[in-house]
Interface confidence: medium
């Protein structure tokens, strides 16, 4: 699985989408989990409704919500009031029995807004950080994400 980056601004909401094959995953509940270390387990944060037919109902665990469009094949996770400690590697999962299939690996990055003059603490300020070392993110990213040769945005 490649890793998809989703960036959010500290203090704001971030929506993460995980598309999937609705037929292949028909009848399956979904979950959002946080990867603990590069090879560690994925700790469940929140899962969809116990009744699959009610998966469209938004379920919350703290500041994280999950909802599933089972017909369209899109799982949506909302992280409310994004904080630096929310940065890291996550997975969208499709559950079947005691097993879980990974739908998408997600790297959540939390950026400070330097224009917001409230106490920014140790947030990552865009334009200043030169590497992940300065940012509060996990390093377990797939090769495709690290393609150094991908140019920034040829601009026109």
């Amino acid at each position: 699985h490649n890793t998809t980056v989703f960036q959010g601004v500290a203090g704001q909401s971030l929506q993460v989408s995980c598309p999937y094959d609705s037929m292949k995953h028909w009848g399956r509940r979904k979950a959002w989990c946080r990867q603990l270390g590069e090879k560690g387990p994925c700790q469940r944060v929140v899962s969809t409704h116990n009744l699959w037919l009610l998966s469209f109902l938004r379920r919350w665990n703290g500041s994280t919500a999950i909802t599933d469009d089972t017909l369209g094949g899109t799982l949506t996770i909302t992280l409310r009031n994004l904080q630096p400690h929310d940065a890291g590697l996550y997975q969208c999962q499709s559950l079947h029995g005691s097993e879980a299939d990974t739908l998408r690996k997600v790297l959540v990055e939390v950026l400070a807004d330097p224009l917001d003059h409230r106490d920014a603490g140790d947030l990552w300020f865009p334009g200043e950080s030169e590497s992940f070392e300065d940012a509060h993110v996990e390093h377990s990213i797939s090769r495709s994400l690290l393609e150094g040769e991908i140019p920034f945005p040829p601009t026109s």
Partner: nanobody
Framework: ESGGGLVQPGGSLRLSCAAS????????MHWYRQAPEKERELVAI?????????NYAASVKGRFTISRDNAKNMVYLQMNNLKPEDTAVYYC?????????WGQGTQVTVSS
């Protein structure tokens, strides 16, 4: 970046920045500017996805508007009521793979 040029005080310009090579809609985007002999200054920021979150430097608030079109991988800066002190090279920026990435910039000159 494109859309810069020479404009009279009180005039308007719309800057555009086309991006490629990454999942544009997932990234926070910024417009910076750099005037001669001055440090680069963050002018505006827009959140990822729908770009509902925006914020502006005090010096441009109420005059500049940042927006994005995720379908076209574009970010825009609408600049109204321009002042001579807005003269600078304007850059769009994204923090990608942990590093800030800059375009070549577009010159905006406000003069009568």
């Amino acid at each position: 970046e494109s859309g810069g040029g020479l404009v009279q005080p009180g005039g308007s310009l719309r800057l555009s920045c086309a991006a490629s090579g990454f999942a544009f809609s997932n990234y926070v985007m910024h417009w910076y500017r750099q005037a001669p002999e001055k440090e680069r200054e963050l002018v505006a920021i827009i959140g990822s996805q729908g770009g509902a979150y925006t914020n502006y430097a005090a010096s441009v608030k109420g005059r500049f508007t940042i927006s994005r079109d995720n379908a076209k991988n574009m970010v825009y800066l609408q600049m109204n009521n321009l002042k001579p002190e807005d003269t600078a090279v304007y850059y769009c920026n994204v923090v990608y793979i942990g590093r800030p990435n800059w375009g070549q910039g577009t010159q905006v000159t406000v003069s009568s």
